[in-house]
Interface confidence: low
């Protein structure tokens, strides 16, 4: 399929102008290459009429232009003074020859319609209301008034002043006069449908003294707005149907031959194919609303319509707005996992791609909720605190320059299953949808922390160990202290690193962290995790309670600690102030080097983020064993 997109059918009338917009993929080559508009001949040859290289054919001289808009990845062909000879098949395309990338456009130019003299032309969209104005002389002030529709030679009455209404106009047509006006009456026809189009005659009086007016009513199908979007990106349908339907249920549907299948409506209906990737948001009290769809797929391409009706379903004679969505498969947005699986008690690390040109943009992670319209409240982000219920188990790790950030969620429960969105405050096309599936665990977790009853005493030394299996032998192990703006890496000591990898002893693979001396602000959540470079793996979390040195101080069991963590005031969860007077015990120099490197990486981005990069140990009292 060609990645060039434009309007399939363009129609106009003689003497008028048309403006045709063609879309192309946003690449440097495409922005600079030749753009052309050619006419398809019977012999299969496409004769250039105008191109961006400055060529202009004789028949287009003085009446056409081609303008490239590289910032929008579009080019526009304007053609004026149309004649019926312009009817035909055309191509808009890119490339040095007319056989390159193109899109077929059909142009139809029709004659100016001929109406009887003094015909007033009314042009209205489907679903709207027309008010036809009928003038008469004073002599017919008390005579019968009527409106009829021409069908061949006959004129069938639509409505008259005796209160007759044609059944097909029932509840849609009214005849009235305004105020004290004695020379004009009006007919309103609402909920217009295509078959209402045609020539109408309004009449006051009978016989030769009757006053007659001709009215031509044109009922327009909505002209679809073209939307060109990349695979895996997102699209927003902005729907403005007017005040008259402000209180009716709204919907977005997708055209399917003769029907239009509802994708989402404000009554809670939602197509399962869009589960987890759609939001409908009312914009104001005037009936405006928008529908956002993320994670665009090839099969999402097609014709869409929004509308309003009390049933929340498409109804003939109600206003609609239309779009044609093209999904460009030559996407710059990388393919990422759409389903991530985890087990209860375990963890997941979700990689979120973003536009690498926008590394300083703010990153967010939100949980799509299937309320009636769908919504996506932020759970964590750079400069956004972790939401309630996620304290101690959710962190966002930015990796500046890599074009991705990682979100880690641990202590998983089956309630965490659902859809999540990765997003930034920058390029809104780079929104990705992930489905998290959490199953019941069937075996022990890979990472285990001892002691599980983690209570440290102020002023004393406290060591906590994380046991890992041999499969993590070659990966980097770390401890970090969780706070509301991330999980900050601490110096730690890997017991297993000293052994030969050939003889990995499953029971003695330990990475430990020591708090020495323990301070009140050391209380909180700590994570043990594994990673390979910028790729984060499994994590486990433990809450360390800190208590005063008292005789016979009671131990807090881990479940109480977790409960306390949930109730702890937000202030306690914030990062403590930097302390540089900690004991620096003997450390493997390799660990020191790693730590310094991490510290620097963290410092560069320190104030651009509120989540920890695989970040600094500053602000923690952790030192190694």
């Amino acid at each position: 399929q060609s990645p060039i997109f434009g309007p399939q059918d363009v129609s106009s009338i003689e003497g008028n102008s048309v403006s045709i917009t063609c879309y192309y993929p946003d690449t440097s080559v495409n922005r600079h290459t030749r753009k052309y508009w050619c006419r398809q001949g019977a012999n299969g040859y496409c004769a250039t009429l105008i191109s961006s290289n400055g060529y202009l054919s004789k028949e287009y001289s003085g009446r056409a232009s081609l303008i490239n808009f590289p910032e929008n990845s579009t080019f526009v062909i304007n053609i004026a003074h149309l004649t019926q000879e312009d009817t035909g098949s055309y191509k808009c395309g890119l490339g040095t020859t007319n056989r390159g990338l193109f899109f077929d456009v059909s142009l139809e130019v029709s004659q100016v319609p001929e109406f009887p003299n003094d015909t007033h032309v009314y042009t209205k969209d489907i679903g709207r209301t027309v008010t036809i104005e009928c003038r008469f002389k004073e002599g017919n002030a008390h005579s019968k008034k009527s409106l009829c529709k021409k069908r061949g030679e006959a004129c069938e009455v639509v409505i008259d002043s005796t209160e007759y209404v044609d059944p097909s106009y029932k509840d849609r047509a009214i005849l009235f006069m305004k105020g004290t006006s004695r020379d004009i009456f009006y007919v309103n026809i609402s909920h217009l449908i295509p078959s209402d189009a045609g020539l109408y005659v309004c009449q006051a009086g009978e016989g030769p003294s009757a006053d007659k007016n001709n009215a031509d009513l044109q009922v327009l199908e909505p002209e679809p707005e073209l939307l060109y979007k990349d695979l895996r990106s997102s699209v927003t349908f902005e729907c403005d149907l007017g005040r008259e339907v402000a209180n009716d249920a709204k919907y977005l549907c997708r055209k399917n031959k003769e029907t239009c299948d509802v994708i989402i409506n404000t009554l809670g209906k939602r197509d399962p194919a869009f589960e987890g990737r759609i939001l409908l948001t009312p914009r104001d009290d005037n009936g405006r609303f928008s529908v956002l769809i993320t994670g665009l797929r090839k099969e999402d391409a097609g014709h869409y319509q929004c509308g309003a009706h009390s049933s929340g379903l498409p109804q003939e004679g109600w206003p609609v707005q239309a779009w044609q969505l093209f999904v460009n498969e030559e996407s710059t947005i990388p393919n990422s996992r759409s389903v991530v699986k985890g087990v209860t008690g375990g963890s997941v690390a979700i990689v979120c791609p973003y536009n690498p040109k926008e590394s300083s943009s703010l990153k967010y992670w939100c949980h799509w909720e299937a309320d009636e319209n769908g919504r996506c409240p932020v759970l964590v982000g750079t400069q956004a605190l972790v939401q309630e219920g996620y304290e101690g188990r959710l962190a966002l790790f930015d990796q500046p320059g890599s074009g991705a950030y990682t979100v880690i969620l641990n202590q998983l429960t089956t309630q965490d299953s659902g859809f999540y969105w990765c997003l930034t405050d920058g390029d809104s096309r780079w929104r990705t949808t992930i489905e998290l599936q959490v199953a019941e665990a069937t075996k022990k977790p890979d990472l285990e922390v001892t002691p599980q009853n983690a209570t440290a005493v102020i002023g004393e030394t406290f060591t906590i160990s994380c046991h890992y299996p041999c499969k993590f032998y070659s990966q980097e192990k770390y401890w970090c202290k969780w706070s509301n703006d991330g999980c900050h890496i601490l110096p730690s000591h890997d017991e297993g690193a000293r052994q030969s990898s050939v003889s990995c002893d499953q029971s003695s693979q330990i990475v430990s962290m020591t708090l020495n001396p323990v301070k009140k602000e050391d209380e909180g959540w700590y994570w043990c995790g594994v990673k390979e470079g910028q790729v984060y793996g499994e994590t486990t979390a433990i809450y360390v309670a800190v208590e005063e040195r008292t005789r016979g101080s009671p131990h807090i069991n881990p479940t109480d600690a977790n409960a306390r963590a949930k109730d702890a005031p937000e202030e306690e969860a914030m990062e403590s102030s930097v302390r540089e007077d900690e004991n620096k015990a003997n450390l493997d120099p390799r660990l020191f080097a790693d730590e310094r490197e991490i510290q620097n990486a963290g410092d560069q981005a320190q104030e651009n983020r509120a989540s920890g990069n695989a970040g600094s140990a500053g602000g923690q009292s952790g030192s190694s064993k």
């Epitope: 997102s234 927003t236 939001l279 948001t281 914009r283 928008s290 956002l292 993320t294 703010l362 967010y364 939100c366 919504r375 996506c376 409240p377 932020v378 982000g381 400069q383 956004a384 605190l385 969105w421 997003l423 930034t424 405050d425 809104s428 929104r431 509301n484 937000e570 202030e571 914030m574």
Partner: nanobody, 121 residues
Amino acid sequence: EVQLVESGGGLAQAGGSLRLSCTASGTISKIDVMAWYRQTPGNERELVARIFSNDVTHYVDSAKGRFTLSRAQDKNTVDLQMNSLEPDDAAVYYCNAQIWSDMRGRMDTYWGQGTLVTVSS
């Protein structure tokens, strides 16, 4: 659309105080973060302090102990009390608000016009 209006900038002596105020108006549901940034000529805007929707405050090291961020009851006004001002604090101070938009499925960032703070030694 959201508008941010700053006030309170001006000239202060080194060691003196100034109070900056920022009010958000327009279509506001819930402001997730309100912050003050500052910028000196030729440098990028840098964060000074911010307050989150649950009233947790965060200060950069240079602001700790000298600057205090507070928010009005309606949560749409934030004040930055700057004490013990130093010549290095001279800059244009910008108010920043971040508001989650369900409609766009993203966090929208808004900026004020900026207010100039001059510190004479």
